[in-house]
């Protein structure tokens, strides 16, 4: 069995990716420079550590979380890294062009790298719904479109709804989920007879997926606090996220056992449900006034996640062609919505407490923000799905879905590797 790309893709991918990389290098050459001011070195190191946490989450966390397929684990990890590397470069430029360009140059700081890494994370969340059904050339397109869509969404939300960096980035959960689901909906769905085993999980890849989940679990507080403006806000965000993910782990494992007739624990449920609390508190992590509230949110999120993992895959598999183990998309879509609702509730309580009028207007703005995020995600996702269906990309045949051997050179070419 041949492990090579089809000849046309061998021509298309390197040319497409390297041309794009050359274009990015030229853009960086003409339009960017480093922040020249002398920084307090201790502050610089602390700032770098946050960016490092985000990179670990993206490269190791999401890379391994999506690697549970029996015969698609190599591709999941490496393609994630490829998309992250490309996405960060494009996101830095795009954010700079959208926010700084009046000065003629994009100033690159550790903060802009942090923002860019978070933007690229959006693609890594979305791609869970399509990994195994697309090749690298198609993923390049997905990265470019999604990062561009998210960057523009964030700018529009900033300008229209006047939200800060944290708030407009926290729409990432809902945006990435709906983007991924709409792309998946456009791709060819049915798995031909005889290939069903490829989208099943295997023990060793499942262990690496659990490792990915653990990395995400450890670093989620960094993600939720990365764009907050003050140490007080960051402290609250870190604490609340930590309590929420801690409770969602307990809920995920016990809830998974409860959902099984024999009381067994499902690896798939646990992979995603351990992160549920972090997603649910993301938007409001700096506003939650006490630990118990974050813990209750973690509990509810864990239950929603396990419930979703039990009942939604059938529907997602039929309608969107998403395999049972790729549950990040609908998980994040539900939990992201929960998080947004919690934020709106806290906003109302805060506004009432301050004795200000216009509560209805504030709520309307928040709902408008959320709706805009969903609409842009769906529209850009559908556009991406249509682009990925073009013959030019030489997409893998349905019979070659979820197969590392289509993309990788294995000396032994053994089926069970």
């Amino acid at each position: 069995m041949s492990s090579k790309y089809p000849r046309s893709v061998r021509r298309c991918l390197p040319l497409w990716a390297l041309t794009l990389e050359a274009a990015l290098i030229l853009l960086f050459y003409f339009f960017t420079h480093y922040d020249a001011s002398l920084e307090d070195q201790k502050g610089l190191v602390a700032s770098y550590q946050v960016g490092q946490d985000l990179t670990v989450m993206a490269a190791i966390g999401l890379g391994f979380l999506t690697s549970s397929f029996r015969r698609h684990s190599w591709s999941s990890v490496a393609f994630n890294l490829f998309m992250l590397a490309l996405g960060v470069q494009w996101a830095i430029l795009l954010d700079g062009f959208l926010s700084q360009f009046p000065s003629g140059k994009v100033v690159i700081t550790l903060f802009s790298i942090r923002l860019a890494t978070m933007s690229a994370l959006s693609v890594l969340i979305s791609v869970d719904a399509v990994l195994g059904k697309v090749n690298l050339a198609q993923l390049v397109v997905m990265v470019l479109v999604e990062v561009t869509a998210l960057g523009n969404l964030r700018m529009v939300i900033s300008n229209i709804f006047n939200t800060d960096y944290h708030m407009n980035m926290m729409h990432i959960y809902v945006f990435a989920a709906y983007f991924g689901l709409s792309v998946a909906w456009c791709l060819p769905k049915p798995l031909p007879e005889g290939t069903e085993d490829k989208d099943q999980t295997a023990t060793i890849p499942s262990l690496s997926a659990m490792l990915g989940a653990l990395f995400l679990w450890m670093f989620w507080p960094s993600f939720n606090s990365a764009l907050l403006r003050s140490p007080i806000e960051r402290k609250n965000a870190v604490f609340n996220t930590y309590y929420a993910v801690a409770v969602s782990v307990v809920t995920a494992i016990s809830g998974s056992s409860l959902a099984h007739p024999q009381g067994k624990i499902s690896k798939t449920y646990v992979h995603s449900a351990v992160l549920a609390g972090g997603v649910a508190v993301g938007t409001s992590c700096h506003l939650i006034p006490s630990p118990w509230l974050a813990m209750v949110l973690g509990l509810v999120a864990g239950l929603i996640s396990v419930g979703g993992a039990k009942y939604l895959p059938g529907c997602c598999n039929r309608v969107l062609g998403i395999p049972h183990s790729s549950i990040m998309g609908y998980n994040f879509s539900l939990l992201g919505l929960l998080g947004e609702i919690i934020y709106i509730v806290l906003l109302v309580l805060d506004t009432v407490g301050a004795g200000n009028g216009m509560i209805g207007f504030q709520v309307l703005l928040s709902i408008g923000e959320l709706s805009l995020a969903i609409v842009i995600a769906l529209m850009s996702g559908l556009l991406t799905g249509l682009l990925l269906n073009l013959k030019i990309w030489k997409a893998p045949h349905e019979a070659k879905y979820f197969d590392d051997q289509v993309f990788w050179k294995f000396p032994h070419l053994a089926v069970g590797f």
């Epitope: 502050g43 700081t109 006047n162």
Partner: antibody
Framework: EVQLVESGGGVVQPGRSLRLSCAAS????????MHWVRQAPGKGLEWVAV????????DYVDSVKGRFTISRDNSKNTLYLQMNSLRAEDTAVYYC??????????????WGQGTLVTVSS | QAVVTQEPSLTVSPGGTVTLTCASS?????????PNWFQQKPGQAPRALVH???KKHSWTPARFSGSLLGGKAALTLSGVQPEDEAEYYC???????????FGGGTKLTVL
């Protein structure tokens, strides 16, 4: 007691550079975002720049982007504003101000007394 | 860049009540703009009065209060004193970066 003391102002020719400093005392400087605000003679206040508590992010009003650089040294409890390519319209009293940000609060609570920068040939 | 508009001047009698407003060119002002109000007397640095729409500082006299009124930020002075004669500025924060934009200021005269 919170104190902010600006220095470094003076008379400078157009196109030249100047560096303002703001020495902070009476609070944990490294826990607060800091702003520069200016006021042209006989005019209103104009916000100029902000730097986050850890120096990780900086933002500027469009009219000074690419010319002014805000920075801080938390070990010295000092805020800086490096002003390059100065223009006549940059003539103003420059104030530094401390920002409290917490949850749904944003507050410029303490201000320095200001330092006068005059750009004239 | 957004423009923040205030009444150029207002006159009030001692003991009276006056409301200063602050409008944004981008539309209705909400708590998300974190309206701040400052008082500045001639030859002095600005002094913070109200932040985050309605929260007062420990040094802010009780007669000052902040709110939102009809899509604008508002500062109300009740029982105005002669020493309240000053220039009043509002500050709104905009966008992802939360850049500040000051209003043009309101000169309050106490006659």
């Amino acid at each position: 007691e919170v104190q902010l003391v600006e220095s470094g102002g003076g008379v400078v020719q157009p196109g030249r550079s100047l560096r303002l400093s703001c020495a902070a005392s009476g609070f944990t400087f490294s826990s607060y975002g800091m702003h520069w605000v200016r006021q042209a003679p006989g005019k209103g206040l104009e916000w100029v720049a902000v730097i986050w508590y850890d120096g990780s992010n900086k933002d500027y009003v469009d009219s000074v982007k690419g010319r002014f650089t805000i920075s801080r040294d938390n070990s010295k409890n000092t805020l800086y504003l490096q002003m390059n390519s100065l223009r006549a319209e940059d003539t103003a009293v420059y104030y530094c101000a401390r920002e409290l940000a917490k949850g749904r609060l944003r507050d410029l609570d303490h201000w320095g007394q200001g330092t006068l920068v005059t750009v004239s040939s | 860049q957004a423009v923040v508009t205030q009444e150029p001047s207002l006159t009030v009698s001692p003991g009276g009540t006056v409301t200063l407003t602050c409008a944004s060119s981008t539309g209705a002002v909400t708590t998300g703009y974190y309206p701040n109000w400052f008082q500045q007397k001639p030859g002095q640095a600005p002094r913070a009065l109200v932040h985050s729409t309605s929260k007062k500082h420990s040094w802010t006299p009780a007669r000052f209060s902040g709110s939102l009124l009809g899509g604008k930020a508002a500062l109300t002075l009740s029982g105005v004193q002669p020493e309240d004669e000053a220039e009043y500025y509002c500050l709104l924060f905009y966008g992802g970066a939360q850049l500040g934009v000051f209003g043009g200021g309101t000169k309050l005269t106490v006659l």
